[in-house]
Every structure is written in structure tokens, then in C-alpha cells.
């Protein structure tokens, strides 16, 4: 399976909400043999590999933000802990999973990584990740709402606030 990032760069004004999204796709065994662990974390662009470093998002670690379920089931993170930090990660039936960050500040700027780990009985884990940049801007140069720049060469899109 693979993970795709719909957008590689999000540029948002301070105070706005944003939803960062990844999609995982490929053959999915609907049986009991497979479990998917999905999570989010902040990182840095490593010299060898992007997303190797795992930093918390607003003091929540990747373990705090994980989703864990079988097949393409929907799931949400523990609401209380995440929402106290203005965060929510979620997953739908179509392979999309996202993290919503509310009331953005300049400190939220940085590289964000989504991670999917496929867990199978008697098989090694399969790990894939996606990376995207969030730039939070303030002042007269800031956009009025979030602008998302696609990972491919398509034109940028305005995305509605979460």
C-alpha cells in the first residue's frame, strides 16, 4: 500500500483552523489478519530521510494521536486529550485520514508527517509516511484563509476552514 499527500504545502493565517490530510490506498485485506496504525507527528527534513524525527504536535506525541483499527474502518483519536490541545485526528472508510488543528499560531509552522503502519500476523510491519509543510502567517502578507498547494503540478486551491 502507499500513502499520498493531497497537498505538500498549506499556508494559513494566524487564528485559522486547518485540516492536513493523507490518503492511503492499495490492496487492503478486510480480514482479521491486518491492523492499521495511523498517526501524526512533527518532524524535520533529515539529511537522509524525511520524517525520521518524531516531535510532538502541541505537546501530544505520535502515540497520543494514533488511530488503530482493522481494514478501512473509520476511527477518531481520544477526544478529550486532543481537543484540549485544539487537535483532532480522524480516519474515514475511503483511506483518508487527517489531523485538524484549531486556532493556528506561528508556533504551529513546520513539517508534519502522517504515518501508516500495517500490522500483520507473522509478517514484518510495513511502514509508509507522507510529509507536508504548514506555514502560519501573520500581518498584511497573510492570506485571508488557508491556501493549499497540491503535491502535483496542479494549481493551488483555497481550502475552507475546518
Amino acid at each position: 500500500f502507499k500513502v499520498a499527500t493531497l497537498y505538500s504545502l498549506y499556508v494559513c493565517p494566524e487564528g485559522q483552523n486547518v485540516t492536513l490530510t493523507c490518503r492511503f490506498f492499495g490492496p487492503v485485506d478486510k480480514g482479521h489478519d491486518v491492523t492499521f496504525y495511523k498517526t501524526w507527528y512533527r518532524s524535520s527534513r533529515g539529511e537522509v530521510q524525511t520524517c525520521s524525527e518524531r516531535r510532538p504536535i502541541r505537546n501530544l506525541t505520535f502515540q497520543d494521536l494514533h488511530l488503530h483499527h482493522g481494514g478501512h474502518q473509520a476511527a477518531n483519536t481520544s477526544h478529550d486529550l486532543a481537543q484540549r490541545h485544539g487537535l483532532e485526528s480522524a480516519s474515514d472508510h475511503h483511506g483518508n485520514f487527517s489531523i485538524t488543528m484549531r486556532n493556528l499560531t506561528l508556533l504551529d509552522s513546520g513539517l508534519y508527517c502522517c504515518l501508516v503502519v500495517e500490522i500483520r500476523h507473522h509478517h514484518s510491519e510495513h511502514r509508509v509516511h507522507g510529509a507536508m509543510e504548514l506555514q502560519v502567517q501573520t500581518g498584511k502578507d497573510a492570506p485571508s484563509s488557508c491556501v493549499a498547494y497540491p503535491s502535483s503540478s496542479q494549481e493551488s486551491e483555497n481550502i475552507t476552514a475546518a
Partner: antibody, heavy 118, light 107 residues
Framework: QVQLQQSGAELMKPGASVKISCKAT????????VEWVRQRPGHGLEWIGE????????HYNEKFKGKATFTADTSSNTAYLQLSSLTSDDSAVYYC???????????WGAGTTVTVSS | DIVMTQSHKFMSTSVGDRVSITCKAS??????VAWYQQKPGQSPKLLIY???YRYTGVPDRFTGSGSGTDFTFTISSVQAEDLAVYYC?????????FGGGTKLEIK
Amino acid sequence: QVQLQQSGAELMKPGASVKISCKATGYTFSSSWVEWVRQRPGHGLEWIGEIFPGSGSTHYNEKFKGKATFTADTSSNTAYLQLSSLTSDDSAVYYCARRPPGWFFDVWGAGTTVTVSS
Amino acid sequence: DIVMTQSHKFMSTSVGDRVSITCKASQDVSTDVAWYQQKPGQSPKLLIYSASYRYTGVPDRFTGSGSGTDFTFTISSVQAEDLAVYYCQQHYSTPWTFGGGTKLEIK
């Protein structure tokens, strides 16, 4: 805070079996692997295998197949390692550790000493 | 199985010295290497993950580097409390394997 509490030391006879426990607190037990590692006196660390409590998935080091059996009880957040047909070679400290999927052994138990002696 | 080789079983150093411990993988493991510290009578502790990143709360005198097959763990200024055995471990494929350990002795 994340903790793994292991059961106490065991003195066993050759040929017997022993079951070691590892109780997890401070995190979602079902969503991380529980690793088992052996350390014989004066030796290094040997990976026995792992269990994912959420699904019951297991991975065993070939060397320990037939010797070690992993189980996990999500109702009590406890993982177990059973060692069978004990010999003096099985005398060691046995550690459990947490490993979030796709990551490393980030929290370790204090270890359980198993001594096999007639 | 991937074999992790730590060429030195023992290293002797003095407080304040810089010391480096090496680890070689029998095949390419990218940056999927961790370093653990085990003090006498204690369980191992994660110090470095993904070859070069310090785990939470680890002092910045501990650093790691490398990728592929060759990895190095460095203590920039050894403290008395760093007396321990240091292990590398690959997390590229199961079975997860550890190096044989390097015992750091303080002169």
C-alpha cells in the same frame, strides 16, 4: 506516565515451565507491541519476539520458537511470556518493553530473573 | 538475519573526554538504528532513535550519526554517570537484532 511492571524472580526446576507477566500502565495497551528480550548473565540483549495485544499478532525469533509463547490480556493490560522445558541455558533476566508500531523500544520493564537449577 | 557488530567490547575513557562507539550492520538498514544505555543492575534505556535523534530527556552530550551500514554513537564529554554498556539495535526488519554491546569504563 508509561510504565511496565514485571513479575518477581522465579527459581525453577529443569523441565518445568514458567510464566512471566508484564503489566502496562499509562498508555493504550492494545496499540503498541510488547517486546520480550533475554539477557543471560554477562551477555548482551537477545530479542525473543513480540505480541500486538490489539490483534494478537505475534512475531517470534526463530531461535525461540517452541521455547517461548506470548499471550496478552487486554482487560488487565498484561502481557505474558511462557517458557517451556526449562534448562540451565534459560537462566537469564527477561525484559518486556513497549514498541509503538513503526518505532523503537522506548520503555522497558525492570526485568524478571529466571533461575533454572536442580 | 541482520547482524549488528560493535567492534569494541570495552572502551576506557576519562571524565570530560569525547568517546565514539561504532556499530556496523551486515546489510543496509537505512537509518533504522537505535542506541540504548544499560547501567549496572538496570534495564536498557533508549537514547538515540533513527540513527541520529535524541529521545525525550536525553542530554545533548549524546549524539548519533550514520546511515546504511555504518553507525556511530558519541558522548562529547563523558560524565561519571555514563558508566554503562551501550547497545545498537536495528529496526529495519525482523528479527530485531542488537549489537553485542560496548562497555564504557571510566578511568
